[in-house]
């Protein structure tokens, strides 16, 4: 029959060529003679010359070493031909199939793979996977079946064999309890693969595996002890700065410490902070410490990571003696602002409070006194008893200097320490309201027509206060009630003045008398203009010209 | 001579907590990894929980998984087992046995936890 | 069901050589060769007898022998005598978070 089973070709066969492979024959060769051909990629198109036939016999010929990496089959068409040309069969099917020689090693897609894997890890992790290729077949030989291994392992600290690798995937695995980054930060591995799946060809390439921390180690004061002197009432002060080392990565949070105060800070008079670079605990006042009440602080730190530990770890503690150094204080008034009650007016040299400072120190110190602000110049003070006596009038109604009813004076404490220090104090004297004052009517100028004349209404007012004041009283004197009548309203707190009787045009004096509730009296003369006119006026008229 | 001794077996209701303890000598104790490993009455050996060496990273196996806490320390060299909701299943030879990187060795000699009402 | 198969029991006559196979899968034995084989007698603790396939540890008798081909690991006994009664298990490394399989043991009988 015109046909032909595929054909197997060993590639990288040795020759000699050209080779003979398989004979083309037609049956009709009995009855005429024929010549044969192929085509296809390989003969007449490229690959060309690859494999040839005999005219005339037929064999099939291979005329060089075929390469499976190259091309795993071939694909051509046997041709049977008589003399005269014409074809005496149809084109046949010719697969010439290249089988497979172990002629690659495998190669690692890297020269170097980087893995990584955190430290304290258990058996089991994987860590990686290496990659290596192989061009020989794997599907119907071993030759391209690739099985890892690890040659070796650099450090071997703690074990010799701390990976392992699976010998088909490439996964790199830790097989050994160990890993510490503290210790071994990094391991080498030569690994290798190796074709016929692990009985040929080797090639090597190394895996770094980068052990990763773990926060397995917990930060250690070094010292574990201090002593700080720090004066009293500084606040915000640096008392000391607490060292610690930690074996973890550092700048890492399973490095960077975390100060906590566990005792000794009852008053909350301490506060302490992570030095961002040094990673010291920075312990401060947060407030002033007070040398008089206690003089040492023992206080008792202790110190953790940001990241929380991965395994049981003792803390460290340090403990950190305060010393609390004495400082001259300035002496503090009592209280510092001091309100005291004080009738106006009262007579020069008259006593009007004691004001006295203490001095936080425990020494007896000397405190001297004086007037450091005293705007109406009323005060004085004794400066060994802190005595205040008035050198002035007290007036209550002295709106320059009295606001509210209250004098404000600022007085001065010194101690005799060395340097000496001061203190102030607010005295604030609240006037007690004397009936100095008698009532004043406004306006003290009125105009009046001299025909059916309007009511003036005067208001009365009074400095002093209640009960210094209104109902006030009205009395008019020096004959001024012939033509004028005054009258208080019920409110008790307006005069109205009326003409009684017709006056020509003219100004006149008004002597008008009033007194307050306590019967403090005033007199005043109110000028008043009489016009000549009817009913409501505001200025006289001029005289009428007539034209 | 390298040596675990397990300790804190005993009779206990369905329901209860026991705490084993194995205590090692003659090796460096926090250098390897160490596991529990149960056999029941007549069974085979079944692989229960581990910890490495710095106690940092602990397995379980499913069946113990949320009951059972592995835990040691390293300053008194000593491994432990904290057994929680105890079922008649967990009856079993308890030993712990260190890992020594492929393999156990060496082994406990065991301790028997009975879970019975 | 355990992760590793081994026959249930073997036997053999003193002086005769037996074999026990342990069958995993290409995550286990196939992938490492980090087999080892434990020798149990009634009422004790498993003693290791072969780690990584075939290496005996100091004082086991070197007529235990190891080996392993594909998927499967196997132990010999060369000269079988009577303490060698006991019940044999097979274990193997795998990756993840159960790192240790075991078989489910063979009881050797001798005869």
């Known amino acids: 029959d015109w046909v032909v089973a595929p054909i197997s070709v060993p590639e990288n066969g040795k020759g000699p060529f050209p080779q003979r492979l398989n004979q083309l024959k037609s049956n009709k060769d009995r009855d005429t003679k024929i010549f044969y051909s192929i085509t296809g990629p390989g003969a007449d198109s490229p690959p060309e010359g690859v494999f040839a036939v005999e005219k005339e016999t037929g064999w099939l010929l291979l005329n060089k070493p075929l390469d499976r990496e190259e091309i795993a089959k071939y694909e051509l068409f046997g041709h049977a031909v008589s003399e005269n040309g014409a074809s005496v069969e149809d084109p046949m099917n010719i697969s010439i199939i290249v089988t497979d020689q172990n002629d690659h090693k495998p190669k690692f897609t890297q020269d170097t793979f980087r893995g990584s894997v955190l430290e304290g890890v258990l058996p089991g992790t994987s860590v990686m996977q290496v990659t290596a290729t192989d061009e020989d077949d794997a599907i119907y030989t071993y030759n391209g079946v690739v099985a890892y291994s690890i040659h070796s392992q650099e450090p071997k600290d703690p074990h010799d064999l701390m990976f392992t690798i699976h010998r088909s995937t490439g996964t790199i695995s830790v097989i050994s309890s160990g890993l510490d980054r503290e210790k071994v930060p990094e391991y080498t591995l030569t690994i290798q693969a190796t074709d016929m799946d692990g009985d040929g060809s080797t090639t090597t390439a190394v895996a770094v595996v980068e052990i990763l921390d773990a926060n397995d180690n917990a930060p250690m004061f070094d010292p574990q002890k201090y002593e700080a002197h720090v004066p009293e009432n500084a606040v915000g002060h640096e008392v000391q700065r607490l060292t610690v080392t930690d074996l973890d990565a550092p700048n890492s949070p399973a490095w960077r410490a975390t100060y906590l105060i566990m005792g000794g800070d009852d008053g909350d008079h301490f506060t302490i902070t992570t030095h961002p670079e040094s990673n010291q605990g920075i312990l401060t006042t947060r407030k002033g410490l007070d040398f008089e009440a206690k003089n040492q602080h023992t206080l008792y730190v202790e110190v953790t990571n940001e990241a929380p530990f991965v395994l049981k770890l003792p803390t460290s503690t340090a403990t950190i003696v305060v010393h609390v150094e004495d400082v001259n204080e300035a002496p503090v008034f009592v209280p510092p602002s001091k309100v005291v009650e004080v009738q106006e007016g009262i007579p020069t040299g008259e006593p009007v409070c004691v004001y006295t400072a203490e001095d936080p120190d425990k020494e007896n110190q000397k405190i001297s006194y004086r007037i450091l602000r005293d705007p109406a110049g009323w005060l004085a003070m004794d400066p060994d008893s802190g005595q205040v006596t008035a050198v002035g009038t007290l007036d209550r109604e002295d709106e320059q200097f009295v606001r509210n009813n209250i004098y404000e004076v600022m007085v001065l404490a010194m101690d005799n320490g060395s340097p000496p220090t001061t203190g102030t104090g607010t005295l604030l004297l609240t006037l007690i309201d004397v009936n100095d004052h008698g009532p004043v009517p406004e306006p003290r100028q009125i105009t009046i027509c001299n025909q059916s004349p309007v009511r003036q209404v005067l208001n009365i007012t009074d400095k002093d206060l209640s009960p210094h004041t209104s109902p006030f009283q009205a009395q008019l004197t020096d004959d001024s009630d012939i033509y004028w009548t005054a009258e208080v309203n019920e409110e008790g707190d307006t005069v109205v003045l009326s003409l009684k009787k017709f006056l020509k045009q003219d100004t006149y004096d008004v002597h008008l008398s009033l007194s307050d509730h306590g019967n403090k009296e005033q007199l005043t003369v109110i000028r008043a203009t009489v016009c000549d006119c009817h009913g409501h006026v505001e200025t006289c008229p001029g005289p009428w010209k007539g034209g | 001579e390298v040596q675990l001794l397990e300790s804190g077996g005993g009779l206990v209701q369905p329901g209860g907590s026991l705490r084993l303890s194995c205590a090692a000598s003659g090796f460096t104790f926090s250098s390897y990894a160490m596991s529990w490993v149960r056999q029941a009455p007549g069974k085979g050996l079944e692989w229960v929980s581990a910890?490495?060496?710095?106690?940092?990273?602990?397995y379980y196996a499913d069946s113990v998984k949320g009951r059972f806490t592995i835990s040691r320390d390293n300053s008194k060299n000593t491994l432990y087992l904290q057994m929680n909701s105890l079922r008649a299943e967990d009856t079993a030879v308890y030993y712990c046995a260190s890992w020594g990187g492929g393999w156990f060795d060496p082994w406990g000699q065991g301790t028997m936890v009975t879970v019975s009402s | 069901q355990s992760a590793l198969t081994q026959p249930a029991s073997v036997s053999g006559s003193p002086g005769q050589s037996i074999t026990i196979s342990c069958t995993g899968t290409?995550?286990?034995?196939?992938?490492?060769?980090?087999v080892s084989w434990y020798q149990q007698h009634p009422g004790k603790a498993p003693k290791l007898i072969l780690s990584?396939?075939?290496k005996r540890p100091s004082g086991v008798s070197n007529r235990f022998s190891g080996s392993k081909s594909g998927n499967t690991a196997s132990l010999s006994i060369s000269g079988l005598q009577a303490e060698d009664e006991a019940d044999y298990y097979c274990s193997s490394f795998t990756s993840g978070k159960t790192f240790v399989l075991f078989g489910g043991g063979t009881k050797l009988t001798v005869l």
């Open positions: 990584e396939v075939n």
């Open positions: 910890i490495s060496g710095s106690g940092g990273s602990t």
């Open positions: 290409s995550n286990d034995v196939g992938a490492y060769n980090y």
